[in-house]
Amino acid sequence: MEDEKPKVNPKLYMCVCEGLSCGNEDHCEGQQCFSSLSINDGFHVYQKGCFQVYEQGKMTCKTPPSPGQAVECCQGDWCNRNITAQLPTKGKSFPGTQNFHLE
């Protein structure tokens, strides 16, 4: 998966969408699905959605979790339905974590 090039006609997956960027929809279609957790205004905020552009997902999905944000990505229809991103626990290191699930 490391340096996989985007296909000419990339496969699109249906993803659960829960977040402001989803507008009035409960689902979206993209090259990758994601589930994220961030700390906003001192509150935990979970979001789900999709990356329509391969490069956008590639960058975000390879970002290791930090104390304020974690993203888990997957490929497959509705693959993010039962994924819950988690923030790193204190004292745990995440060497080379990519939080990427291929389904």
Partner: antibody, heavy 120, light 108 residues
């Protein structure tokens, strides 16, 4: 400091409309949804609908579809809820509420409430 | 579509543990959020995402969610905890659902 400040109490006649405002401060207006929740005297909380200012379009609870209109004015960071064809059962306190930035699942901040009385 | 059911009232003695339940079909599939409302005031978020506590909410408030039931637990209940409590879930962009509310009475 997040604040939601609502307009004052209203007394309306059956069949008329009411428009309640909710001015938001603290945080970027376009980065959260504004919801409207009502509470009839002695009753529980009832979600009416929401608007994401960035998108401009609103979602409504089925019960209020066709009778409620939620709008937002980004220039003044104000959301509005208009309820038409009022009847006595619409007598309630109407609250606006929002989550923290980007959140859609719960309400972290509430307005003080606006009492709307429908009486002939 | 999910509906949430709460007991209309719960009574507890000061210092004791109060448990307020919220039941709904397959509720564990959703995240439960809890609000406290005192007479004449707007609701206040006390627990969100089943068991997370906003800053400023006392540690005696906790939550859980399993099976068909979410539970708000108040340990060492104090007189100031007397209020109405509502559970809520996000069902879809068109549906935020509240339970009917539970009046918590602190005896004595």
């Amino acid at each position: 400091q997040v604040q939601l400040v609502q307009s004052g109490a209203e007394v309306k006649k059956p069949g008329s409309s009411v428009k309640v405002s909710c001015k938001a401060s603290g945080g970027t207006f376009s980065s959260y949804a504004i919801h409207w929740v009502r509470q009839a005297p002695g009753q529980g909380l009832e979600w009416m609908g929401r608007i994401i200012p960035d998108f401009g379009t609103a979602n409504y609870a089925q019960k209020f579809q066709g009778r409620v209109t939620i709008t937002a004015d980004e220039s003044t960071s104000t959301a509005y809820m208009e309820l038409s064809s009022l009847r006595s059962e619409d007598t309630a306190v109407y609250y606006c509420a929002r989550g923290p930035t980007q959140a859609i699942h719960y309400f972290a901040y509430w307005g003080q409430g606006t009492l709307v009385t429908v009486s002939s | 579509d999910i509906e949430l059911t709460q007991p209309p009232s719960v009574s507890v003695s000061p210092g004791q543990t109060a448990s307020i339940t919220c039941s709904g079909d397959n509720l564990r599939k959703y995240s439960a959020h809890w609000y406290q409302q005192k007479p004449g005031q707007a609701p206040v978020l006390v627990i969100y995402y089943d068991n997370k506590r906003p800053s400023g909410i006392p540690e005696r408030f906790s939550g859980s969610n399993s099976g068909n039931t979410a539970t708000l637990t108040i340990s060492g209940t104090q007189a100031e905890d007397e209020a109405d409590y509502y559970c809520q879930v996000y069902a879809s962009v068109h549906r935020m659902v509240f339970g009917g509310g539970t009046k918590l009475t602190v005896l004595g």
